[in-house]
């Protein structure tokens, strides 16, 4: 029973007041004429956090977000009126909500906003060096934002800007019906997914986009989109949501005769995050909310962390599932989904798969095609009618690494930090919720690396009022976490070792990989430090073995709360 394990009770539960009083949170409470601090871009080099919001773009100092610069980028009164005339809400919709904020080159960012239901993009100058202290809008250079930013501020864009080209998953029309994955900017003709074909995309909600190399040859690079969408008829009885991972080759330039200016290498697969139910029916967490890629050593094989919630209004729950890219690739090399038979059900395609296999990038690695425009007609025809894979991607260990079903909140965001501790490396998850709290959770391997135990270290309230956490970034350099919501932004340190108490036992029992007992206090653990006196036991949290200071007695309550 995952959700009710003893480790699901937080070691520390800190209210907003306690966070403030202990100097563990810095907040930017927003401007009177702005809101929706949802679009984050972290720049560790410049030590800045760029944030897109309503009618504004901010540049926050990573050391202290109280120190910031701002650009005001509203819409003209005419655009605002036009939007109002279209029956939209003047405050919530008829403004410029920034949805895309990406590094364009060494000196500029690229930003796109809803433009009061008239998407617009521009460049922001940030200078060559941090000391230039430049942060200004290129007023002379505005571009059409269609296919880059949604019209409707309620919708998200998943975007990625690489080599001067913008990949974006968004809604490309006023009504919010024409969802597509686009590639714009750059020197090539814009490319998109097939229009009005529910087999490709079926009312999707895009979460994020990531470039993941396939091999050492950059020609094989793929862009992966994470999204959720309506299950296609026949795939599921009744209306259901499915979480998806989609792939596109970076060097896809569309077809020659068919799929002209459309992706020829687009494939998608379902992401499963479920637990076995008591009656043999699995409980599915299908509403993908956020994704975090943990890159470690090998950029080709990041670990994918996904945050999911249930679709049901009756049963509310959240889960975190982990996926390996080798499992993802195996599914994309597996059978395609095919509609056949008297009931028009989805079955694995059994026929001949054309060569080169649809979804393969044109490169020297996998065959002699230089461009997708050279692909044979049968490959293009097959690709157009078979965008989905039959097999789903199952999570590592075939189950979530964390579940919450007995609480009045749901998970919304996740970032993960890999921490060196005395007894190995640990992944620490910071999970944002829809009530403005952040959970700090450590994954502890049991017998094998695949078998993980989740320990809930802290539950922190980071906003004064309950508000949905809509963005999170983690700075390893600053050892800080940055959190966005409609109301504002919060900054907090990744660790609060001193709060764990004044004795070795308490420090050990905390099982926080960031913290160790140094002989006199619970403080930040640095693996490079030579001190042999550091006491820490993340795997077992056993003070008896590690603490010899006599400070154990009466301090063994594992669920010590600070209220």
């Amino acid at each position: 029973n995952y959700q009710n394990g003893k480790n699901n009770v937080p070691r520390l539960k800190l209210s907003y007041k306690e966070m403030l009083e202990s100097n563990n949170v810095i907040t930017f409470n927003g401007l009177a004429n702005s809101s929706s601090y949802h679009t984050f871009l972290l720049d560790e080099e410049r030590s800045r956090l760029y944030v897109g919001a309503k009618d504004h773009i901010f540049s926050f100092n990573l050391v202290n977000i109280k120190d910031f610069q701002k650009i005001v980028w509203p819409v003209s009164y005419t655009r605002r009126d036009e939007c109002k005339w279209a029956g939209k809400d003047i405050l919530k919709e008829c403004a410029n909500f920034i949805k895309v904020l990406k590094a364009y080159n060494q000196t500029h960012l690229y930003a796109c906003g809803t433009g009061a239901f008239h998407p617009i993009c521009t460049y922001i100058e940030i200078g060559h060096h941090p000391e230039d202290n430049i942060f200004k809008l290129e007023n002379s250079h505005f571009e059409n934002g269609r296919g880059k930013s949604p019209y409707d501020p309620k919708l998200l864009t998943a975007s990625l800007l690489i080599d001067g080209e913008l990949y974006s998953g968004t809604a490309a029309d006023f009504m919010g019906r024409d969802f597509a994955i686009f590639r714009t900017l750059g020197h090539h003709h814009p490319i998109r997914t097939e229009q009005h074909d529910s087999r490709w995309l079926n009312d999707p909600r895009f979460i994020s986009a990531h470039l993941i190399p396939e091999s050492d040859n950059p020609e094989d690079d793929k862009v992966y989109f994470f999204f959720r969408e309506n299950a296609i008829d026949g795939e599921h009885s009744g209306k259901a949501t499915h979480a998806r991972i989609g792939q596109i080759c970076k060097n896809d330039f569309g077809g020659h005769r068919s799929l002209v200016n459309k992706w020829t290498t687009f494939l998608k697969a379902r992401l499963i995050c479920s637990v076995p139910g008591p009656n043999g029916i699995d409980t599915h967490f299908d509403e993908l909310q956020d994704v975090f890629l943990m890159n470690f050593k090998d950029p080709k094989n990041p670990i994918v962390y996904g945050v999911f919630t249930t679709s049901s209004n009756i049963f509310k729950g959240s889960a975190v599932c982990m996926y390996s890219m080798s499992d993802v690739r195996r599914v994309f090399l597996g059978p395609y989904a095919h509609r056949d038979g008297p009931n028009y059900q989805w079955v694995p395609y059994q026929g001949r798969v054309p060569y080169p296999r649809p979804g393969t990038c044109p490169s020297k690695t996998f065959g002699g095609f230089d461009s997708t425009k050279d692909l044979p007609d049968d490959v293009i025809t097959f690709a157009r009618s078979h965008p989905a894979m039959y097999n789903p991607v199952f999570p590592i260990n075939n189950r979530p690494i964390m579940i919450k079903t007995d609480v009045n909140y749901q998970f919304t965001q996740i970032v993960v930090d890999r921490v060196d501790a005395e007894d190995g490396q640990y992944d620490v998850m910071f999970i944002g919720t829809d009530v403005g709290t952040v959970l700090k959770v450590v994954s502890i391997p049991k017998e094998t690396w695949h078998d993980l135990e989740e320990v809930l270290l802290e539950e922190m309230t980071v906003f004064r009022e309950p508000t949905t956490i809509s963005a999170m970034e983690l700075s390893t350099k600053q050892q800080q976490l940055y959190i966005g919501s409609t109301a504002g932004i919060a900054q907090l340190p990744l660790h609060r070792c001193d709060i764990y108490g004044k004795a070795c036992a308490e420090c050990c029992l905390a099982r926080d990989p960031y913290c160790a007992w140094d002989g006199s206090s619970c403080s930040r653990y640095f693996p490079t430090a030579k001190a042999r006196t550091r006491a820490q036991d993340i795997r077992n949290g056993d003070p008896l073995t590690h603490c010899s200071d006599g400070g154990i007695e009466g301090r063994m309550d594992h669920h010590h709360h600070h209220h």
Partner: antibody, heavy 116, light 111 residues
Framework: EVQLLESGGGLVQTGGSLRLSCAAS????????MSWVRQAPGKGLEWVSW????????YYADSVKGRFTISRDNSKNTLYLQMNSLRAEDTAVYYC?????????WGQGTLVTVSS | QSVLTQPPSASGTPGQRVTISCSGS????????VSWYQQLPGTAPKLLIY???HRPSGVPDRFSGSKSGTSASLAISGLRSEDEADYYC???????????FGGGTKLTVLG
């Protein structure tokens, strides 16, 4: 210089149909909402319909709803008004206007006469 | 009958100052920008004032607009003979979901 040139007006019987066109130049047509406004002989101005810059949304005055259809072709920089089931009270000069929070540029108008 | 109410006519002698009023409600003038249009005899209307009080380039500063509550007014100072025209006020009406005009005011320059 912004120019709007209407065409397609003329004499039509009650219940008949007519299609008005408006050719635009001198501005980025695809960036702006467009509208039709009419003026009955010797009377004041009456807004008829408007269309979003990308055709994403269309709006009509109650007096023409269900009978008139506004459309545009951004590749041709042209605005259209398809008028069906015409009535005597639809007799007017029809102006095409560029929308910019108000009607900042107007065409010279085309006369539509509906005779019974 | 027009949603916005204007006097049917107004007059003045050259050099004089003339004011034309436009009365509406909270669903139009009260919560939306007012524009004024000039229609010279036999020509198409032309935008004179936008966003209550702003003049497009090329419009002389003799023309000014103002708004208070649910009423707006157009003032023309230093009246000239070429100002003889029909003047219309207009605004978006939130409850009707449409643009509404006043019935128009015929301005006559005497003498």
């Amino acid at each position: 210089e912004v120019q709007l040139l209407e065409s397609g007006g003329g004499l039509v019987q009650t219940g008949g149909s007519l299609r008005l066109s408006c050719a635009a130049s001198g501005f980025t047509f695809s960036d702006y909402a467009m509208s039709w406004v009419r003026q009955a002989p010797g009377k004041g101005l009456e807004w008829v319909s408007w269309i979003y810059y990308d055709s994403g949304s269309k709006y009509y005055a109650d007096s023409v709803k269900g009978r008139f259809t506004i459309s545009r072709d951004n590749s041709k920089n042209t605005l259209y008004l398809q008028m069906n089931s015409l009535r005597a009270e639809d007799t007017a000069v029809y102006y095409c206007a560029k929308l910019n929070g108000d009607f900042d540029y107007w065409g010279q108008g085309t006369l539509v006469t509906v005779s019974s | 009958q027009s949603v916005l109410t204007q006097p049917p006519s107004a007059s003045g002698t050259p050099g004089q100052r003339v004011t034309i009023s436009c009365s509406g409600s909270s669903s139009n003038i009260g919560n939306n920008d007012v524009s004024w249009y000039q229609q010279l005899p036999g020509t198409a209307p032309k935008l004179l004032i936008y966003a209550d009080s702003h003049r497009p380039s090329g419009v002389p500063d003799r023309f000014s607009g103002s708004k208070s509550g649910t009423s707006a007014s157009l003032a023309i100072s230093g009246l000239r003979s070429e100002d003889e025209a029909d003047y219309y006020c207009g605004a978006w009406d939130s409850s009707l979901s449409g643009y509404v005009f006043g019935g128009g005011t015929k301005l006559t320059v005497l003498g």
